[in-house]
Amino acid sequence: TQNKALPENVKYGIVLDAGSSHTSLYIYKWPAEKENDTGVVHQVEECRVKGPGISKFVQKVNEIGIYLTDCMERAREVIPRSQHQETPVYLGATAGMRLLRMESEELADRVLDVVERSLSNYPFDFQGARIITGQEEGAYGWITINYLLGKFSQKTRWFSIVPYETNNQETFGALDLGGASTQVTFVPQNQTIESPDNALQFRLYGKDYNVYTHSFLCYGKDQALWQKLAKDIQVASNEILRDPCFHPGYKKVVNVSDLYKTPCTKRFEMTLPFQQFEIQGIGNYQQCHQSILELFNTSYCPYSQCAFNGIFLPPLQGDFGAFSAFYFVMKFLNLTSEKVSQEKVTEMMKKFCAQPWEEIKTSYAGVKEKYLSEYCFSGTYILSLLLQGYHFTADSWEHIHFIGKIQGSDAGWTLGYMLNLTNMIPAEQPLSTPLSHSTYV
């Protein structure tokens, strides 16, 4: 008689990352009997929702249902039908929705209500949609990468099973760059965290972690660009803005009303004698870098040391995983290799930004012009943020690892969020037989 394969005893979970520029759906899978083990959850699918972030639906909420359909239907296909009713679905919205809430709590609530209505009508175990805090976003990103890197495992290994593993239990710091905010999270070395808002205490798998985190709202790459434009147009002599962060020959018309739509540009807002202005690229890395530095107020620090804008930042410690837009931008620029020094990155950026727009368009014919046009700014911004904002140096640059995926799972906050909400990160080290835990992150 043939042995029949027993049905897989697995569980699934779905997290939607409702970011400022787009929404992505992630499907995770794990063996049911190993829920409390570290490193057993892995991503089986990512589905990028077509269209902008959910905050852009504020005037067309009736379109949210259609917007989410394709990826939710994909989830129905990927997850076995017998598991649908038991599969939790979570939606976390980040800085795009934080900004909308700052403008109008009522409008943000309406968007979330309609998102929830749409997601509730699928046959999964929908657990609600919410705007996560910047602190959560940083913390869950840190949990994700360290979980995937095996840093919470008590078993020390003589061999490396994942890239970047330094064969010790020192956790990695997490650097996350989105469209509207950026997060820095790490365990400082024997340093008291001087501002309580930036301090997190975790007990994970029997070990205590004192973690520093901060989320800089308005310092994601898209909002930083809006800030820079709003700052620079203040001193423009007419409706032409000669911009070093765009390639020579690049031209784009910007509506002043769009520029001042976001709360991030309020501090630069002024009455301008025109409704539109034209960006004309001049492609100069050094000037672009200088312009970006003006977004960081480093003149004021009420602590022993700061990042910028008076925000406490302890001395950097250990290795860092830089993911999300840090990775996507650097990957496009072919600058993610461990071997590329900071000086080399700067050199490459100088060359890239100086390339004429027509040449760039020809070289990258398959890339949407909207995205293509902004890589010079984004790359320069990443360098400025890491070096002047967070105080990385040419020497400590080698401790930054640009990470897209670890073990097939995307680096980002979503996995950590799900692990926490499904109680899969025990406070104590599990025994060989799973225990029921009452204390979680």
Partner: antibody
Framework: QVQLVESGGGVVQPGGSLRLSCVVS????????VHWVRQAPGKGLEWLGV???????DYNAAFMSRLAISKDNSKNTVYLELNSLRLDDTAVYYC?????????????WGQGTTVTVSS | DIVMTQSQKFMSTSVGDRVSITCKAS??????VAWYQQKPGQSPKLLIY???YRYSGVPDRFTGSGSGTDFTLTISNMQSEDLADYFC?????????FGGGTKLEIK
């Protein structure tokens, strides 16, 4: 356990208005939406509208001009106001809890409150 | 508005029968259909959602099927306590709409 209890029904004159209440227990209005559905004598069910957990509302367009749904989370109560009543508004009015957070199908219904529009 | 049509207003059945109640949508509603049971003097009770998913606590003799425009609620082994009105409901788009109902009676 989950319960919804409607009140406020009775006899109303044509052209008048009614205000129905739905007191809920066993769940929080900050976690689930509540719909209103009515059933005319010997007829099928007709959806009126919903109030979602953060307070936004959606109405059946056929009632938009004369219907308002509101809630008071602290009193665990949802309200339905219907104006310019007509004879064909005579029905049993139900409030119903969304089966999932904000879904459009219902796992718990109230017992209903009868409204009779008559001169 | 989407019209949900339950063409059989009444159906005569016997205990132990297999009963199929049909519901037709005037346009595609995907699988966004629920079925309710309503006994005289009571409020409706949810049986099926997403066209074919049984609500918790509902006996497994109740099965839903269909997608698009044609939907069926099947009772595989009719019991006397199943004598009731059955309504379908679409929730694919607003306004939410219900079928006119099918009443099960004993032959």
């Amino acid at each position: 356990q989950v319960q919804l209890v409607e009140s406020g029904g009775g006899v109303v004159q044509p052209g008048g208005s009614l205000r129905l209440s739905c007191v809920v227990s066993g769940f929080s209005l900050t976690n689930y939406g509540v719909h209103w559905v009515r059933q005319a004598p010997g007829k099928g069910l007709e959806w009126l509208g919903v109030i979602l957990r953060r307070g936004s509302t959606d109405y059946n367009a056929a009632f938009m001009s004369r219907l308002a749904i509101s809630k008071d989370n602290s009193k665990n109560t949802v309200y339905l106001e219907l104006n310019s009543l007509r004879l064909d508004d005579t029905a049993v009015y139900y409030c119903a809890k969304t089966a999932v957070v904000a879904g459009d199908y219902f796992d718990y219904w109230g017992q209903g409150t009868t409204v009779t529009v008559s001169s | 508005d989407i019209v949900m049509t339950q063409s059989q207003k009444f159906m005569s059945t016997s205990v132990g029968d297999r009963v199929s109640i049909t519901c037709k949508a005037s346009q595609n509603v995907g699988t966004n259909v629920a079925w309710y049971q309503q006994k005289p003097g009571q409020s409706p009770k949810l049986l099926i959602y997403s066209a074919s998913y049984r609500y918790s606590g509902v006996p497994d003799r109740f099965t839903g099927s269909g997608s698009g425009t044609d939907f069926t609620l099947t009772i595989s082994n009719m019991q006397s306590e199943d004598l009731a009105d059955y309504f379908c409901q679409q929730y694919n788009s607003y306004p939410l709409t219900f079928g006119g109902g099918t009443k099960l009676e004993i032959k």
